[in-house]
């Protein structure tokens, strides 16, 4: 059974992941982003089901495409903090949260999504899990 300290650790990791995802979304989803129109043309796979921490496997598998699209956004008038570091941090948290005991085959929804829809989906996921822990 999960202890209160492990629950607290999970909660903090989820909050960190949530903040990182929100910061990415805040950085791209505004009119000052000169590459937004182009970024919205890239398609991301969405999880068919995302209700448990193990479903973070589906996020992990999309981190490489996410990094590529974020690299596209970099310009002198637009700054995300170092994309490689950001994605690496997210990857570390995701690996810790989902655990490595069981490797899940991720099931994706039929419809693909824009980067904004993709990030919003995983933000909602984090918020939902956090609310069950508190």
């Amino acid at each position: 059974a999960p202890t209160s300290s492990s629950t607290k650790k999970t909660q903090l990791q989820l909050e960190h992941l949530l903040l990182d995802l929100q910061m990415i979304l805040n950085g791209i989803n505004n009119y000052k982003n000169p590459k937004l129109t182009r970024m919205l043309t890239f398609k991301f796979y969405m999880p068919k089901k995302a209700t448990e921490l193990r479903h973070l496997q589906c996020l992990e598998e999309e981190l490489k495409p996410l990094e590529e699209v974020l690299n596209l956004a970099q310009s002198k008038s637009f700054h995300l903090r170092d994309t490689k570091d950001l994605i690496s941090n997210i990857n570390v948290i995701v690996l810790e949260l989902k655990g490595s005991e069981t490797t899940l085959m991720c099931e994706y929804a039929d419809e693909t999504a824009t980067i904004v829809e993709f990030l919003n989906r995983w933000i909602t996921f984090c918020q939902s899990i956090i609310s069950t822990l508190t």
Partner: antibody
Framework: QVQLVESGGGVVQPGRSLRLSCAAS????????MHWVRQAPGKGLEWVAV????????YYADSVKGRFTISRDNSKNTLYLQMNSLRAEDTAVYYC???????????????????WGQGTLVTVSS | DIVMTQTPLSSPVTLGQPASISCRSS???????????LSWLQQRPGQPPRLLIY???NRFSGVPDRFSGSGAGTDFTLKISRVEAEDVGVYYC????????FGGGTKVEIK
Amino acid sequence: QVQLVESGGGVVQPGRSLRLSCAASGFTFSSYAMHWVRQAPGKGLEWVAVIWYDGINKYYADSVKGRFTISRDNSKNTLYLQMNSLRAEDTAVYYCARGSYYDSSGYYFGEDFDYWGQGTLVTVSS
Amino acid sequence: DIVMTQTPLSSPVTLGQPASISCRSSHNLLHSDGNTYLSWLQQRPGQPPRLLIYEISNRFSGVPDRFSGSGAGTDFTLKISRVEAEDVGVYYCMQVTQFPTFGGGTKVEIK
């Protein structure tokens, strides 16, 4: 001093079109993004659209996407909002507001929505 | 879209007394550039909105120092230290971290 003056409002039937204008003075219009915001009678504020300083990028609220078009003429210091397929729920006072400043090195800065026009009333009714 | 929720809906205050308005955002408003783009607007009866505060706590030019803003992340507050008759109107919080969204407004009236 900064001045924004909207015009073009009036009473229009559902399904018809209307074009609003916003005449700007007192600042370098071609260096600023510009917004349209609306306010239904007795209600709160709703962002409608934004256009970049150079007119290249335009973004819209979902409620008006595909029906409204924002544009600008920097030589005339004027912002426009072309409203097609008007609906009763588009009835509102429409305000133009100044957005962020874009400098020559390619950076946006400054406050969004720092100056507003007096507004022009659009009534959609049969 | 980011949802901005303001409380209270209405705030009857006595002249010279303080007033406080809260605003909560559905998302953290910290932008990747390090700024938090949360503003406060005042709309007097029959007037267009007017910018009071930007980036949480910066007073716009010409705004009296009785107005102050505070907060971080998702929770923000506008305070009027001593309410004057000219402060009557509706106050809106708004975010421009993402595409702009407004709070529902708080009506400040004199008791």
